[in-house]
Interface confidence: low
């Protein structure tokens, strides 16, 4: 799903307040709901009819440092006999997510949000067949 | 996929630098790669063999303000005849993502990252049936 552009007003104080320095704001350390966790079924990436593999990317100047990307294993879907059925399609499910980018020049450290496109998994769909006359 | 806890060192400056004020850091406004966007197949939520609906939650003090959650429509999966087959399971694919929370007390505005669990879509899997004697 799509993350809309950040509104100019999002980083602003109420109108009656003195303006903030252009370009930066105060970021509290720590993460709200940091202990919240995924409760997905086990090994769905291999048990799915549209199975996928995971690739991990690592960047120490990003939080989270580890970003995991899924890649669909097949063009088609796996049928009850364990064979690929190319009358159906395995398609990626994507999600726009935010990460925090750490930027430092010497002793000056600042942070900025970065939008990252993550493929979370795959699903099996009926193909769109637009017949052209 | 799981976001690990933020390391204490992530918000710190290099050792040779003077310490930063405890509890807050500088957040640059603007979003890196803000124009990047999802390029998913059309209507996969209705074309999937494990179809889902979307629910939108809205919070003006969160960026993005709109967070979309998927809910699987069925317990089973949709077969070639368009009927539900409950020998298979539709299961949610979840992703831990970050949002930016705006907090204000009077004229003091600060921001904090918040972890949000998003169900991105659903996939069709073979059920786990380990029978333990």
């Amino acid at each position: 799903r799509k993350i809309p552009k950040v509104g100019h007003t999002f980083f602003q104080k109420p109108e009656s307040c003195p303006p903030v320095p252009e370009g930066s704001m105060k970021l509290d350390t720590g993460i709200i709901n940091e202990n919240q966790r995924v409760s997905m079924s086990r090994n769905i990436e291999s048990r799915s009819t549209s199975p996928w593999n995971y690739t991990v990317t690592w960047d120490p100047n990003r939080y989270p440092s580890e970003v995991v990307q899924a890649q669909c294993k097949h063009l088609g879907c796996i049928n009850a006999q364990g064979k690929e059925d190319i009358s159906m399609n395995s398609v990626p499910i994507q999600q726009e997510t935010l990460v925090l980018r750490r930027k430092h020049q010497g002793c000056s450290v600042s942070f900025q949000l970065e939008k990252v496109l993550v493929t979370v998994g795959c699903t099996c769909v009926t193909p769109v067949v637009h017949h052209v006359q | 996929r799981k976001i690990p806890k933020v390391g204490h060192t992530f918000f710190q400056k290099p050792e040779s630098c003077p310490p930063v004020p405890e509890g807050s850091m500088k957040l640059d406004t603007g979003i890196i790669n803000e124009n990047q966007r999802v390029s998913m197949s059309r209507n996969i939520e209705s074309r999937s063999t494990s179809p889902w609906n979307y629910t939108v939650t809205w919070d003006p003090n969160r960026y993005p303000s709109e967070v979309v959650q998927a809910q699987c429509k069925h317990l089973g999966c949709i077969n070639a005849q368009g009927k539900e087959d409950i020998s298979m399971n539709s299961v949610p694919i979840q992703q831990e993502t970050l949002v930016l929370r705006r907090k204000h007390q009077g004229c003091s505005v600060s921001f904090q990252l918040e972890k949000v669990l998003v169900t991105v879509g659903c996939t069709c899997v073979t059920p786990v049936v380990h029978h333990v004697q």
Partner: antibody
Framework: QVQLVQSGGGLVQPGRSLRLSCAAS????????MHWVRQAPGKGLEWVSG????????GYADSVKGRFTISRDNAKNSLYLQMNSLRAEDTALYYC??????????????????WGQGTTVTVSS | EIVLTQSPGTLSLSPGERATLSCRAS???????LAWYQQKPGQAPRLLIY???SRATGIPDRFSGSGSGTDFTLTISRLEPEDFAVYYC???????FGGGTKVEIK
């Protein structure tokens, strides 16, 4: 051997709270969904609540929604039922039970193959 | 929600006779999710059958389950004295148990 040992029942006044515990042994507790089932005197079985292996999926019967809270501590191999705002109609023998299969749809039951001995909850003034 | 109705409420039979217990669902239920239990006075329920027809560990073969869709049956081929008890069917969902059938000595 595989067993579930319950504790925490008793006599309580309407509106008060009680916490039931269920200690598991003899199987890999954190692989399985767990359930609470009750039986009012002279009546049939009523499913109360269920919780998945990792607490990610939780379900309640309409009759207890908003008043009862199921939880588990996998490190302690224990299941709990926190019962608040108790009513006379909550009077029953309460059983904890283990889900038969390691399954995805943990709020749905294939069957319950191991049961606790039961603990009596009496709500009366 | 799916409601399970068991019949008869009470079944009066003699040892050695065949018992046929019915469980009817208000809408179609996958046989994967249909189970039967036995409960004797003062005891916890005991799983007999799961997946509509599979016997649980240690259950004698005189107990058998069958059925699909909305109609399921538990059959006890020859009643033994220890089989006189209450029997419940169960399906997945938020109101999973039937009302029970009491099998009593005639």
């Amino acid at each position: 051997q595989v067993q579930l040992v319950q504790s925490g029942g008793g006599l309580v006044q309407p509106g008060r709270s009680l916490r039931l515990s269920c200690a598991a042994s003899g199987f890999t507790f954190d692989d399985y969904a767990m359930h609470w089932v009750r039986q009012a005197p002279g009546k049939g079985l009523e499913w109360v609540s269920g919780i998945s292996w990792n607490s990610g999926t939780i379900g309640y019967a309409d009759s207890v929604k908003g008043r009862f809270t199921i939880s588990r501590d996998n490190a302690k191999n224990s299941l709990y039922l926190q019962m608040n705002s108790l009513r006379a109609e909550d009077t029953a023998l309460y059983y904890c039970a283990k889900e038969l299969y390691i399954s995805d749809w943990d709020s749905y039951s294939y069957g319950m193959d191991v049961w606790g001995q039961g603990t009596t909850v009496t709500v009366s003034s | 929600e799916i409601v399970l109705t068991q019949s008869p409420g009470t079944l009066s039979l003699s040892p050695g006779e065949r018992a046929t217990l019915s469980c009817r669902a208000s809408q179609s239920v996958s046989s994967s999710y249909l189970a039967w239990y036995q409960q004797k006075p003062g005891q916890a329920p005991r799983l007999l059958i799961y997946g509509a027809s599979s016997r649980a560990t240690g259950i004698p073969d005189r107990f058998s389950g069958s059925g699909s869709g909305t109609d399921f049956t538990l059959t006890i081929s020859r009643l033994e004295p220890e089989d006189f008890a209450v029997y419940y069917c169960q399906q997945y969902g938020s109101s999973p148990f039937g009302g029970g059938t009491k099998v009593e000595i005639k």
